[in-house]
Structure formats: C-alpha cells, structure tokens
C-alpha cells in the first residue's frame, strides 16, 4: 500500500507519458489523477512501467472503480490485465468481442490462466451462448478451449458455430463431449456432398452412433485408423466385417496392428472368425465356426 503524500511542485501529471516511468511509487500515487489514467489507459501499454509502478496504477483504478472497471477502460488495459485477479474480473461486464480479443492477445502463446478463464466465462455468460465469432476467437487463441467445456456448457453451442471448429480443437475432447458436438456437426454439415461432408464430420465421429457409421460405410470414405480408433466402442461393435471393410477401404490393413486395442479388440470378439478370415489379415479371436451367437441385449429389450 502506498502512503498518501502530497505531489511535489511541478510534478502533477498532465498526461500519461514516458516521463512517468521516472516517478517513484509514491510520486505516481500522489501525482497521477485516476480519472486521467482511466481516459488515457491506451497509452500505458506503450510505456515501460515497472512491475511495482503497475501496482500503483492498478490501485488507482481500483479506487476509482470499486464496483468494477467500465468496458472503455477494460478494452485498453493491455498488459495491466495480467495484474488482475479472477475476483477483479468477476466484477466486469465485457460485451465486446474486440475487448476480449485485446485481452487474450496479452496472454497469447501461454496456457489459459485463471484470469483468462474467468474473463471468457464472464463474456460467454453475458452473451448467453457460444456464437460463431466468439468460438472462432477463442479457438484461435486456445485450440483446446472447446474440450475444456462440460457437456452441459457445450449444449449451448449453436450448430452454426461448428463451422469455426478445426480438427485440432477437438484433440483433447472426451467421448461425452463428442456425444454433444456430433449431432450439432451433423446438422451443420448436412447440406454438403459425400466427400466434403466426411472431411468436415471426421473430427466429430467419436460421438457418432452405429447407424451413422453404417451409412458412411456405403460412401467410400476410406476412414483412417486414427479416426476409427476414436469411435465409440458401443457404436463399432454392431458393425459387420463387410461394413468395417467398406468404412476403412485401403486402411483396413491397419486393423492388424490395433487388434489388441479397443475398439478393435472388442469388435473382433463379436465377429465370426470365418468373416474375419475373409479380410486376410490374420485377425484372431473371433467366434469359432459352428457357435451360435445370442444377442442377450436384444432379448432383454423384448421381454
């Protein structure tokens, strides 16, 4: 805390400029008017104030705006944003995407800090939903942003926003998140033709049900093994050998290398060994010839 002392004669700041970097902390406190600082916040970023001097400037703004800074000040905080605590940010009402971008720029190239997470949360809650422009901005700065949201939060993403999602944005999503995103993606891309549709939907297929995988198998999509390995096990199990062969196309040979891993392992256990042999890959572990397969889940559903 800086002591309250009178400003020395001739040192009263008329504007926020470079001369202030030579002021001691107590001089900044005494000689810089908080209202002047607020109206000239855009200049602070261009002036190499020390860490301690920035403490004084923040303190002045906090005194001027105890209920939280107005957006006109927030937009020009620049690197002073890095001094803010999540508690400070919770008092803000940020509505402009330009303000959000300006503050994210300061943290660019770094992990999402608690301050940034709070800022984004305030912004998205204020907007009511994750619209396309917001999602575009957030995933540009934080590719993993989408996968940091809960399935409940993802449910507020409108299908139109899915166009902003890049494959790498989904890298860390778990199946529960993809379950929410997949139907939105399906809706968003529904008017595209076969091959273009597959390119767009591919990253979301970890949330696809069996019937959609069966439909894709009829379209010569040549799904790669990496995508296949991310499919829901329960969606893959009912697929026939012929359907998997059509789905993977030339990539079907990759099944051999993955035969011990889910979902391939579990799928093999459900197939007739005769059918697996038709692939010519030496896959083992299928149901021996002559055995009868009872689908107990179907029987339970009927009773």
């Amino acid at each position: 805390e800086v002591e309250k002392t009178a400003c020395p004669s001739g040192k009263k700041a008329r504007e926020i400029d470079e001369s202030l970097i030579f002021y001691k902390k107590w001089e900044l406190e005494a000689c810089v008017d908080a209202a002047l600082l607020a109206t000239q916040m855009d200049r602070v970023n261009a002036i190499p104030f020390t860490y301690e001097q920035l403490d004084v400037l923040k303190h002045k703004l906090d005194e001027l705006y105890p209920q939280g800074y107005p957006e006109s000040v927030i937009q020009h905080l620049g690197y002073l944003f890095l001094k803010m605590s999540p508690e400070d940010i919770r008092k803000w009402n940020v509505t402009s995407l330009e303000t959000l971008k300006a503050l994210l720029e300061v943290n660019k190239g770094h992990e999402m800090s608690p301050q940034v997470a709070t800022l984004i949360d305030r912004f998205v809650k204020g907007r009511g939903q994750l619209d396309k422009d917001t999602l575009d901005t957030l995933t540009a700065f934080y590719p993993g942003y989408l996968c940091s949201l809960s399935p409940e939060e993802l449910s507020s993403v409108p299908p139109s926003s899915i166009w902003a999602v890049r494959p790498q944005d989904l890298d860390t999503c778990d199946p529960r998140q993809l379950d929410v995103l997949y139907p939105k993606a399906r809706l968003a891309f529904q008017n595209m033709n076969g091959s273009e549709y597959f390119v767009k939907i591919q990253s979301f297929l970890g949330g696809a049900p069996t019937e959609d995988l069966k439909a894709l198998s009829q379209q010569n999509v040549s799904m790669d093994l990496a995508t296949f390995m991310k499919l829901r096990t329960d969606a893959v199990l009912p697929l026939t050998v012929a359907e998997v062969q059509k789905l993977l196309g030339p990539h079907v040979e990759g099944l051999k290398a993955e035969e011990r891993h889910r979902p391939v392992r579990d799928w093999i256990l459900r197939q007739r060994q005769d059918d697996l042999d038709t692939l010519g890959l030496g896959l083992q572990g299928g149901i021996p010839n002559g055995y009868l397969v009872l689908d107990l889940s179907m029987q339970e559903a009927l009773s």
């Epitope: 190499p48 860490y51 690197y79 890095l82 001094k83 300061v106 943290n107 660019k108 190239g109 770094h110």
Partner: nanobody, 118 residues
Framework: QVQLVESGGGLVQPGGSLRLSCAAS????????YGWYRQAPGKQRDLVAI???????NYADSVKGRFTISRDNSKNTLYLQMNSLRAEDTAVYYC????????????WGQGTQVTVSS
Amino acid sequence: QVQLVESGGGLVQPGGSLRLSCAASGITFPVNAYGWYRQAPGKQRDLVAIISAGGTTNYADSVKGRFTISRDNSKNTLYLQMNSLRAEDTAVYYCYLQRRIGMLRDYWGQGTQVTVSS
C-alpha cells in the same frame, strides 16, 4: 532461466567515462524493455535510462546528454555509455529487463559498482 550479468564498473575521476555492459542469457520470450537503474548508498533504486523493444530511449533528467543506452541484439548485450561523470553518479548500477507477454515480470542483474572520485 534468465540471467543478467553486468560488467564495466569501477573507479573513475570526475569528468571521466565508463561503459557498462550487461550480458543477457536464458531469454525465451519477447522483451518489452531493457533499462539501467542505480542505487546510491542509503537511497532508493532509481531509473537511469530505458530502451523499449522498438528502440525508443528515455533518460532521467539528471543524466540527459551525458549517458547513452543502447543494445546489440546479435550479442544479447545492453550497454550504458557514461560520459562527463560526476560524484553524484556514484552508485551500484543494475541492468533490468521487462517481460510483458503471458506474464508480468521484471528481471534484475546483481549490479556493478561505479565510483566517481578524485
């Protein structure tokens, strides 16, 4: 980690010159500004000169026209050329740099003693 090592200090007569150097290493981020501070015995540390990433320089009134700050990016070295030295320039001189992207952090060297005396 970031290391700033000053050199070039020493004893000099009034009116003489010295050139301080500061070798920086371990910098893996964009630097916002480099500077020189000094601290005389029993006094607070004061900013002497600063140079921004864009090359803009600023000087304390007491050294304007006598001191020149510069840097050599290829050698990762900061300099302070001090001419027309006075007794009141006697102090420990510290090299300093600012990080302002991703985190706010100021880095300081250990200091080099400059004594101006006849």
